[in-house]
């Protein structure tokens, strides 16, 4: 009878081990061990046992101990198990953001590992077991589905291998994946809202707000806001799920023309745009043209109103015929039309809005000076002894200096408060004199004797 | 569609003058600014000039100030470029090409027309 | 000089992704453009914007910007696609309205 001691043993890959091989009879012909495995015969005294070390057990193996004696022959098995941790458990890669409300799949792939009896593989979220498996195939797969909550948002999903060799009295071996931490996200499929100046003129500031609600987590999102090829700077706020994006634009020359104004968030792996036109206008205020600001009574005037090719004006309220960027008006220049204002306002569609510009000149009529009844009487008839004011008011542009003369000497205090003298009687000679000329005329003052009675 | 065809170019002598055109069609001209941009054979483009859409502000590259000048005539959807006092170094394939903005990129472009300044 | 700086030269094996770079500090201001010139032919807009292709550009043609460079990136790279590459961009220095990268000669293996 031949025997095996252990008869089962469970080691770890590359180990070795002691196997004792031992027969009935005492004289035996033959005592062995039949095994691929490395093998050193350790010597002990007598024939009827011998202990073989086996090493480098890299697979399960069933050596057999084997014994001729004068009764027979026979043989004995004995079990060796090998275990060993898997050589790799990783998680199938994922894109780290992951929009809320979707079905995302775990899958945790285990290569090696035995044996595969005690092998189990575990997907976790946290702490949290998600699914527990058994290993099987190679490499062994195990799969789940999460649907995607914001409060996953940060999670870490990991895999785990338990090798369970309690039952054997060893211990448990746990291997982990690296672990792949969920970013969730909400991006809402409303675009943002873009609020901005449809139309902008060149040299000019204008303000664009671009804002969106029912983001998560609204701190990751980014904002991209774009005028033509120009990057905005935006201040941006942010609330508890939205933003707002502020940002100023400053206009030149430069951006003359239509411009798309973009307002792009990205959150995740997702974005979403907006686009509005902006047009950039250069419109500067129309010229109004005087042939001379300044011109002397009877001259004829030329007054031309110019605006920008595509404006329409109207001058002093008259559209320009054909209607047009030019308006023009022809008068012979009145004491009337001295201070008068020729006013020039001119119109320029741009993308459907009306812009208006004016510009106003005045004209300067050069006339007089001038004497006249109304405003200077020739005659005057005054109590002795009364107060009176004489008024002679001389007309003309520029304004005439004005003098009245009794006998070339004596002067007429106008516009000054008197009391009236007989020296005050006589004829004065008002004299009104400017740069276009002087004018002259009698004024005759009366005075009155008071009656005694 | 859009298309945009340089003409005028030519053989000149240095200090010689020449008038490029470039005929627009298939946009709204008159609200699209435009632009010249060069390149000497076998070597890159060069922006050199370009004009906003009402004819009212004009830029030029340092190498042409002085001696080109671009204008536009939005009745007849025409692109101009005058250009004098002309050097060797002037010698390019002219495309002209247009913008929705002065400062803008480039939508679309001419098949170029060769000015060659030699003696 | 040229105030935007590309490689002379890169070549791509058909089918795979290749990046073209352009450097220059107005492109920290402004995007840049992208036009593509096959021999004998006029520039072609291929980006504009952060990432915008005209109509009838592949989508394999994108666009992207960090700091003051700006990519042009062909993923799946075709025959066709050899050609010059020249970025473009505003003049933030203002010498200029519009200033051009030197080009890049794309060879498809």
């Known amino acids: 009878q031949t025997s095996v001691s252990p008869s089962k043993v469970i080691l770890p890959r590359g180990g070795s081990v002691l196997v004792t091989c031992s027969t009935s009879c005492d004289q035996p012909k033959l005592l062995g061990i039949e095994t691929p495995l490395p093998k050193k015969e350790l010597l002990l005294p007598g024939n009827n046992r011998k202990v073989y070390e086996l090493s480098n057990v890299q697979e399960d193996s069933q050596p057999m101990c084997y014994s001729n004696c004068p009764d027979g022959q026979s043989t004995a098995k004995t079990f060796l198990t090998v275990y060993w941790t898997p050589e790799r458990v990783e998680l199938a890669p994922l894109p780290s953001w992951q929009p809320v409300g979707k079905n995302l799949t775990l899958r945790c792939q285990v290569e090696g590992g035995a044996p595969r009896a005690n092998l189990t593989v575990v997907l976790l979220r946290g702490e949290k077991e998600l699914k527990r498996e058994p290993a099987v195939g190679e490499p062994a797969e195990v799969t789940t589905t999460v649907l995607v909550r914001r409060d996953h948002h940060g999670a870490n999903f990991s895999c785990r291998t338990e090798l369970d060799l309690r039952p054997q009295g060893l211990e448990l071996f746990e291997n982990t994946s690296a672990p792949y931490q969920l970013q969730t996200f909400v991006l809402p499929a409303t675009p943002p809202q873009l609020v901005s100046p449809r139309v902008l003129e060149v040299d000019t500031q204008g303000t664009v707000v671009c804002s969106l609600d029912g983001l998560f987590p609204v701190s990751e999102a980014q904002v991209h806001l774009a005028l033509g090829d120009q990057r905005l700077n935006p201040t941006v706020t942010y609330g508890n799920d939205s933003f707002s994006a502020k940002a100023s634009v400053s206009v030149t020359a430069e951006d003359e023309g239509t411009q798309r104004l973009t307002c792009a968030v990205i959150l995740g792996n997702q974005s979403q745009e907006t686009l509005q036109t902006v047009t950039i206008y250069s419109f500067p205020a129309p010229n109004v043209i005087l042939t001379k600001p300044e011109v002397s009574e009877g001259t004829e005037v030329t007054v031309k109103c110019e605006a920008h090719p595509r404006a329409k004006v109207t001058l002093n309220g008259v559209p320009a015929q054909p209607l047009g960027p030019r308006a023009q008006l022809l008068l012979k220049a009145t004491p009337e039309d001295n201070g008068r204002s020729f006013s020039c306002s001119a119109t320029l569609e741009v993308a459907g809005q009306l812009i208006h510009k004016n510009q106003t000149r005045e004209l300067r009529v050069l006339y007089g000076p001038r004497l006249d009844e109304r405003d200077c009487p020739g005659n005057w008839t005054w109590p002795e002894n009364s107060q009176q004011t004489p008024m002679c008011q001389a007309w003309g542009n520029p304004l005439p200096e004005l003098k009245c003369l009794k006998d070339g000497t004596f002067p007429l205090p106008i516009g000054e408060s008197v009391t009236v003298t007989r020296d005050l009687e006589g004829t004065y000679l008002c004299r009104a004199r400017s740069t276009q000329g002087e004018v002259t005329r009698k004024v005759t003052v009366n005075v009155l004797s008071p009656r005694y009675e | 569609q859009v298309q945009l065809q340089e003409s005028g170019g030519g053989l000149v002598q240095p200090g010689g003058s020449l008038r490029l055109s470039c005929a627009a069609s298939g946009f709204t001209f008159s609200s699209y600014a435009m632009s010249w941009v060069r390149q000497a054979p076998g070597k890159g483009l060069e922006w050199v000039s370009a004009?906003?859409?009402?004819?009212?502000?004009?830029y030029y590259a340092d190498s042409v100030k002085g001696r080109f000048t671009i204008s536009r005539d939005n009745s007849k959807n025409t692109l101009y470029l005058q250009m004098s006092s002309l050097r060797a170094e002037d010698t390019a394939f002219y495309y002209c090409?247009?913008?929705?903005?002065?400062?803008?990129?480039?939508?679309?472009w001419g098949h170029g027309t060769l000015v060659t300044v030699s003696s | 000089a040229s105030e935007l700086t590309q490689d002379p030269a890169v070549s791509v094996a058909l089918g795979q992704t290749v990046k073209i770079t352009c450097q220059g500090d107005?492109?920290?201001?402004?995007?840049a453009s992208w036009y593509q010139q096959r021999p004998g032919q006029a520039p072609v807009l291929v980006i504009y914007?952060?990432?915008s292709r005209p109509s009838g550009i592949p989508d394999r043609f994108s666009g992207s910007s960090s700091g003051n460079t700006a990519s042009l990136t062909i993923t799946g790279a075709q025959a066709e696609d050899e050609a010059d590459y020249y970025c473009?961009?505003?003049?933030?220095?203002?010498?200029?309205?519009?200033?051009f990268g030197g080009g890049t000669k794309l060879t498809v293996l």
């Open positions: 004009i906003s859409g009402s004819g009212g502000s004009t």
């Open positions: 090409a247009n913008s929705a903005y002065t400062g803008g990129w480039y939508d679309y």
């Open positions: 107005s492109l920290r201001t402004y995007y």
């Open positions: 914007g952060e990432n």
């Open positions: 473009n961009s505003r003049d933030s220095s203002g010498n200029h309205l519009r200033v």
